[in-house]
Interface confidence: medium
């Protein structure tokens, strides 16, 4: 058995359903996506040995499914997947990788072929600990590269300052596949949001620990850089589920307004 979870049940149906649903979000000139063709291109990786899938095996899939990302709407992240999805609000606020077509169809899913058979493996799939060239990691590497290349304007990044190992994973998708593929000439600045879990530990904030590494790296690449601790719009969303926590107390001016009302 592999270390990762097996192929998601009803993978094809979920994929095609998400694809069809997403088409409605695209502008009319980009809506002519053929979901069946996109699935067939994706399925190429499902016909290969589960430790022999390269990022390039998804090239056709990416070419068929890619579309433009609105300027200033890109949102990169590490260790904050659910919060990013909630805040992005189905492309309304931002368009993270999970809100572009090629990311949406695979978000939170797992897939691989059986090791010595042509069928899908529903029991387990390899992770990077099992082998580097596994179907899921290779997919997200290729998708991450494309997402970076297509991003422009103000780049937003949400990181988790409560993560025990640090807000910026020095080895991670953002560090290894996204930062190197940012197109400097298309980008005006990079804005980082270091979010802390409500009631959680403050492991790192802007300018601390691994965040220093990220700041140095981006500045040395020639990017304009800014960092915000607990970006208020995201904090307010976190507070929806923790309304009575002290971290979510309204500022006195707002409270006074409430009392007058």
């Amino acid at each position: 058995r592999w270390r990762g979870e097996g192929t998601s049940a009803h993978l094809r149906d979920i994929f095609l359903g998400r694809c069809a649903e997403y088409r409605a979000l695209l502008s009319p000139e980009q809506r002519n996506k053929n979901c069946t063709a996109i699935w067939e291109a994706f399925k190429v990786a499902l016909d290969k040995d589960p430790c022999s899938v390269l990022p390039s095996d998804y090239d056709l899939f990416i070419n068929l499914s890619r579309h433009s990302i609105p300027r200033d709407k890109s949102l990169f992240w590490e260790n904050s997947h659910l919060l990013v999805n909630s805040f992005a609000d189905n492309t309304r606020r931002f368009m993270p990788l999970s809100d572009v077509l090629y990311g949406r169809v695979a978000d939170f899913l797992s897939w691989c072929r059986q090791k010595n058979d042509s069928g899908l493996d529903y029991q387990s799939c390899p992770t990077s600990e099992d082998c580097e060239n596994n179907p899921v990691d290779s997919f997200w590497k290729r998708a991450s590269i494309q997402y970076s290349k297509d991003s422009s304007g103000v780049i937003h990044v949400m990181l988790n300052g409560s993560e025990p190992t640090g807000a910026y994973p020095i080895k991670g998708f953002f560090a290894d596949y996204e930062i190197p593929n940012l197109q400097k000439e298309k980008i005006t600045r990079i804005e980082i949001w270091v979010m802390h879990e409500i009631g959680g530990p403050n492991v790192e904030s802007c300018g601390e620990g691994s965040m220093k590494v990220l700041e140095k790296r981006l500045k040395d690449m020639g990017f304009q850089y800014s960092c915000i601790n607990d970006y208020r719009p995201v904090k307010l969303l976190q507070c929806v589920d923790h309304s009575t926590h002290p971290d979510c107390a309204l500022k006195s001016a707002a409270a006074a307004t409430q009392r007058k009302a």
């Epitope: 403050n202 790192e204 300018g207 620990g209 691994s210 220093k212 140095k216 040395d220 020639g222």
Partner: antibody, heavy 120, light 107 residues
């Protein structure tokens, strides 16, 4: 063997300028962050400024911001500290130091130090 | 700025003693802490980094420990050549800060 040799110190009047240099040898200079640390006579150590490997990031302690400028010439393996509007409280031995690697800011090699005296 | 407080400021000990120096940070510094030794008239020398990692070439009688806000430098058996001032430094934030130092002398 790693060597860091500071120069350019001396006696200067308040309000005047001085430029310190640090010649590095024995390692690939462009692979390391560098910094300046000072020590007032019979006092503790005080970080002054840091610069990242390609010079894209520079950082200063609040008391020298706007007066001091750290820079580097990777081709010459030299670190600089331009000190303007000097004050008496800037009197100290200034050490050129090497950051250990790209990720952290502890300092594994130090120069012998150069004395800067600000006095009228 | 993160305040670093060292104690004691002066410590007298005998050769062979086990010596413990303390450094307290004003907030959690996530073990981003280094210890330096400065002999009289010389530049400081790195002993310990990341709270407990021994720098290459430093004798094994030196060790570091601690986490969060509280850190310790221990000399397991004091030698005459260890007479010096010891400084701790946090590098968790951009504004690296040093403690005021502990002067170690022989009794």
């Amino acid at each position: 063997e790693v060597h860091l040799v500071e120069s350019g110190g001396g006696l200067v009047q308040p309000g005047r300028s001085l430029k310190l240099s640090c010649a590095a040898s024995g390692f690939t200079f462009s692979n390391y962050d560098m910094a300046w640390i000072r020590q007032a006579p019979a006092k503790g150590l005080e970080w002054v400024a840091s610069i990242s490997i390609r010079g894209g990031s520079t950082y200063y302690r609040d008391s020298v911001k706007g007066r001091f400028t750290v820079s580097r010439d990777n081709a010459k393996s030299t670190l600089y500290l331009q000190m303007d509007s000097l004050r008496s409280e800037d009197t100290a031995t200034y050490y050129c130091v090497r950051g250990t690697d790209y990720y952290y800011d502890y300092f594994d090699y130090w120069g012998q130090g150069v004395m800067v005296t600000v006095s009228s | 700025n993160i305040q670093m407080t060292q104690s004691p400021s002066l410590l007298s000990a005998s050769v062979g003693d086990r010596v413990t120096l303390s450094c307290k940070a004003g907030r959690n510094i996530n073990s981003y802490l280094a210890w330096y030794q400065q002999m009289l008239g010389e530049a400081p020398k790195l002993l310990i980094y990341n709270a407990n990692s021994l720098q290459t070439g430093i004798p094994s009688r030196f060790s570091g420990s601690g986490s969060g806000t509280d850190y310790t430098l221990t000399i397991s058996s004091l030698q005459p050549e260890d007479v010096a001032t010891y400084f701790c430094q946090q590098y968790n934030s951009w504004t690296n800060t040093f403690g005021a130092g502990t002067k170690l002398e022989l009794k």
